[in-house]
């Protein structure tokens, strides 16, 4: 399978995790498959839900991927960059607070550079009820990690922040952020931000990036 | 911003047309796009909207019959076509990303309509 | 169309100032108020949309409030980059409209 939307296609409608295979290649990569949401067949990309990961990890880490496609993970950025270069994907992202309020932001068309290019992301078309800007920087910036500062900042947001990110400088989102529990969440400046959506220094309890092909 | 780049500005008579070009970054593909114009020393004038695909244009009704907005997404650009002028119609023009409210914009064209 | 009343035109101030403006629509506008500084020659800058909503990289000295018809842009210590025109704009109905502006004077 290249995507969850083909493992949807192929008849196989129950969330879960599934063996996905690199484009034109025999490497394959181990993803969770959202099959509920909005029609099913979406490729989780990133989760956040309870602290239990370290995302302040290598440039190489957030390349191939890391934590369980079960929990907290990142699927890796090579994977994505290739699978999104492939055809049209759109990105949607999933929040939730503190308070029990739930939001998302939909990308009509989404993806990453090559590694070459730093992963940079590429967004069009936002949508949705987390913000009516988006809180990912447009145009989009090189990603960073804490071995690989390609942000716009003197500073190296990666280190200050804590996580991979496209940063800016350092910009409006890091979804890969320290996690902080309820209660110690807010007035807080590297933790999980959308800040479209909840502001300055609020920490998200939890987040999911999942993509899936425009012409699902 | 050099993501939103108007020209097509210039000088015309008063009755005749002119056709202002908007060149945008890719990345607009997909949002609703505005024309705002201001007068000399003046404040800003909504002039209108197009939608992505160009299929929902609003133009602000003091407007209408005289002016036409369009866009050739496959040249990432935005158009306003505009005919009839009078020397009222001197202004800036800039184009805009509209989200309602406007949070990119170009670097605006200058229109003067004399004899 | 909506009228925007945007009071006073102009003012005169110091920097660290503390400094205010008012936009008042003629009609019910739900939050749907922006706000925008414009330098000379210079194309319009967002500053705050729905009516209290920072944009990112705006200073934190800029606020917005106020519900209903009547808006306020605040600016809480006047520093010698905000001398400027400042415009309100309602996007709650066409045609979008915008008060006539308040230009920020040294004193």
């Known amino acids: 399978f290249r995507d969850c939307a083909d493992v949807f296609r192929s008849g196989l409608t129950t969330s879960g995790i599934y063996t996905l295979t690199f484009p034109n290649s025999t490497e394959e990569t181990k993803a969770y498959c959202d099959m509920e949401t909005g029609g099913g067949g979406w490729t989780t990309i990133q989760r956040r839900e309870d602290g239990s990961v370290d995302f302040q990890r290598t440039w190489k880490e957030y390349k191939v991927g890391f934590g369980n496609p079960s929990g907290e993970h990142w699927l890796g950025n090579e994977f994505v960059s290739q699978l999104t270069n492939q055809q049209r994907y759109v990105l949607k992202i999933h929040l939730r607070d503190w308070e029990g309020n739930e939001a998302y932001s939909l990308y009509e068309h989404f993806y990453l550079s090559s590694e070459e290019f730093n992963y940079r992301i590429h967004l069009k078309g936002l949508t949705g009820t987390a913000g009516k800007i988006s809180s990912i920087s447009q145009p989009g910036n090189d990603f960073s990690t804490k071995d690989a500062d390609n942000d716009k900042c003197i500073c190296k947001c990666s280190q200050m922040l804590t996580g991979g990110w496209w940063f800016d400088a350092c910009g409006p989102s890091n979804l890969n952020g320290m996690y902080y529990p309820q209660r110690q969440n807010t007035n807080k400046f590297n933790g999980i931000k959308w800040y479209y959506w909840k502001g300055s220094g609020y920490s998200l309890k939890a987040t999911t990036m999942m993509i899936r092909p425009a012409d699902f | 911003s050099e993501h939103l780049v108007e020209s097509g500005g210039g000088l015309v008579k008063p009755g005749g047309s002119l056709r202002l070009s908007c060149a945008t970054a890719?990345?607009?593909?997909?949002?609703?796009m505005s024309w705002v114009r201001q007068a000399p020393g003046k404040g800003l004038e909504w002039v209108g909207s197009?939608?992505?695909?160009?299929?929902?244009?609003y133009l602000n009704t003091k407007f209408i019959g005289r002016f036409t907005i369009s866009r050739d997404d496959s040249k990432n650009t935005l158009y306003l076509q505009m005919n009839s002028l009078r020397a009222e119609d001197t202004a800036v023009y800039y184009c805009?990303?509209?989200?309602?409210?406007?949070?990119?914009w170009g670097q605006g064209t200058l229109v003067t309509v004399s004899s | 169309a909506i009228y925007m009343h945007q009071e006073p035109s102009s003012l005169s101030a110091s920097v660290g100032d503390r400094v205010t403006i008012t936009c008042h629509g003629s009609?019910?506008?739900?939050?749907?108020v922006a706000w925008y500084q414009q330098k000379p020659g210079k194309a319009p800058k967002l500053l705050i949309f729905?009516?209290?909503f920072k944009v990112y990289e705006v200073p934190s000295r800029f606020s917005g409030s106020g519900s209903h018809e009547d808006y306020t842009l605040t600016i809480s210590s006047l520093q010698p980059e905000d001398f400027a025109t400042y415009y309100c704009?309602?996007?709650?109905?066409?045609?979008?409209?915008f008060g006539h502006g308040t230009k920020v004077e040294i004193k």
């Open positions: 890719d990345f607009f593909e997909y949002d609703d």
């Open positions: 704009q309602q996007y709650r109905y066409h045609p979008y409209t």
């Open positions: 729905d009516g209290d």
């Open positions: 009609y019910w506008l739900n939050s749907e």
């Open positions: 805009a990303r509209d989200v309602g409210f406007f949070d990119w």
């Open positions: 197009i939608s992505p695909k160009g299929d929902h244009k």
